[in-house]
Interface confidence: low
Amino acid sequence: SSSPTSSASSFSSSAPFLASAVSAQPPLPDQCPALCECSEAARTVKCVNRNLTEVPTDLPAYVRNLFLTGNQLAVLPAGAFARRPPLAELAALNLSGSRLDEVRAGAFEHLPSLRQLDLSHNPLADLSPFAFSGSNASVSAPSPLVELILNHIVPPEDERQNRSFEGMVVAALLAGRALQGLRRLELASNHFLYLPRDVLAQLPSLRHLDLSNNSLVSLTYVSFRNLTHLESLHLEDNALKVLHNGTLAELQGLPHIRVFLDNNPWVCDCHMADMVTWLKETEVVQGKDRLTCAYPEKMRNRVLLELNSADLDCDPILPPSLQTS
């Protein structure tokens, strides 16, 4: 049973509470929502920096590009863009910087042409596992998404739940195998400490993967083997210390790959020998001549390409009886 939507005017919070609006009848095809700018010729609607607290209900049916940036949406409920008739043309949706802290299951359902989605710069404390798949079935209908931009969606430390942020994001990416057609995935600036091992294997169509400006320490358990279409892999500004043989071999085996590794704290000891040898031979690393050692102190700022095996030693580990204080 259903009941009339009630007023939420007595609510207050740092992010406004949303009650979905009731749309009595379909919008006129040429109608432009209040606080938005519309161009039918460009099939574009812009509702930018307007402090909107909900998605306008009267979006024109022609909209192909929708910008809802710089608002205060707080919550995207299920079917937030479901309309009668549906927004069948909507292909690019930008919701960046709109203070979203929750994206619910099925938030993007009924958008059959949605190819690009940008949720960047929203503190997503609660991203439903079924935000993109819209279904809790083990195999969902394929999503039309080709590009998914999720840069800087990590919430402040005090708003994070007692669960892995990485795990929450990956669960949404993998649910129902709906994103098999995804070609571009951007996850920059999210404080990721690790990459769950199954994520890449289940996104086989990826061409571009951006993991820059995270806190990744190691890629030891990450497999790139199945990403045969991968063209760019951005790993700049992480906490990588060394790439091991298995990773090097997998990257070298990808036919179209370009890897970006700048600004990582490379540890130039005996474990770095394989990576240095590989760097000298490979064509896949962009700007490889800029990669420098961060540790140990005696190696700081040395260029990796200029190192030889004699430079890459590991201090012997002394037995406790011989250690001095």
Epitope: S23, P77, A78, G79, D126, E159, R163
Partner: nanobody, 120 residues
Framework: QVQLVESGGGLVQPGGSLRLSCAAS????????MSWYRQAPGEERELVAS????????RYADSVKGRFTISRDNAKNTVYLQMNSLKPEDTAVYYC?????????????WGEGTLVTVSA
């Protein structure tokens, strides 16, 4: 079939406490935000509190902030409303709500409600 069953209502004196429960079935409870509404006689139904899917974020009506606490147990498919320092103006029928889709398409679901009476 979606079902929401509220319990825990009753008569309580001003300043007293009650804990309402809402048992959910027929949908993947952990994937949806849940809310409590209330409706006093002759008044419009109003939002009281809501909680996000994993309980990481809660929101409250101004009139109940600091007195009411919403929580959920996804293992038990249950959402709770702890009501302290109750006032006569809290008297109403309290409804549990699950918004499984757009309200405009009739995809939100309600329980039958449980009556809370605050009176000396």
């Amino acid at each position: 079939q979606v079902q929401l069953v509220e319990s825990g209502g009753g008569l309580v004196q001003p300043g007293g406490s009650l804990r309402l429960s809402c048992a959910a079935s027929g949908f993947t409870f952990s994937s949806y935000a849940m809310s409590w509404y209330r409706q006093a006689p002759g008044e419009e139904r109003e939002l009281v509190a809501s909680i996000t899917t994993a309980g990481g974020s809660t929101r409250y009506a101004d009139s109940v902030k600091g007195r009411f606490t919403i929580s959920r147990d996804n293992a038990k498919n249950t959402v709770y409303l702890q009501m302290n320092s109750l006032k006569p103006e809290d008297t109403a029928v309290y409804y549990c709500n699950a918004e499984l889709g757009p309200r405009r398409l009739g995809m939100d679901y309600w329980g039958e409600g449980t009556l809370v009476t605050v009176s000396a």
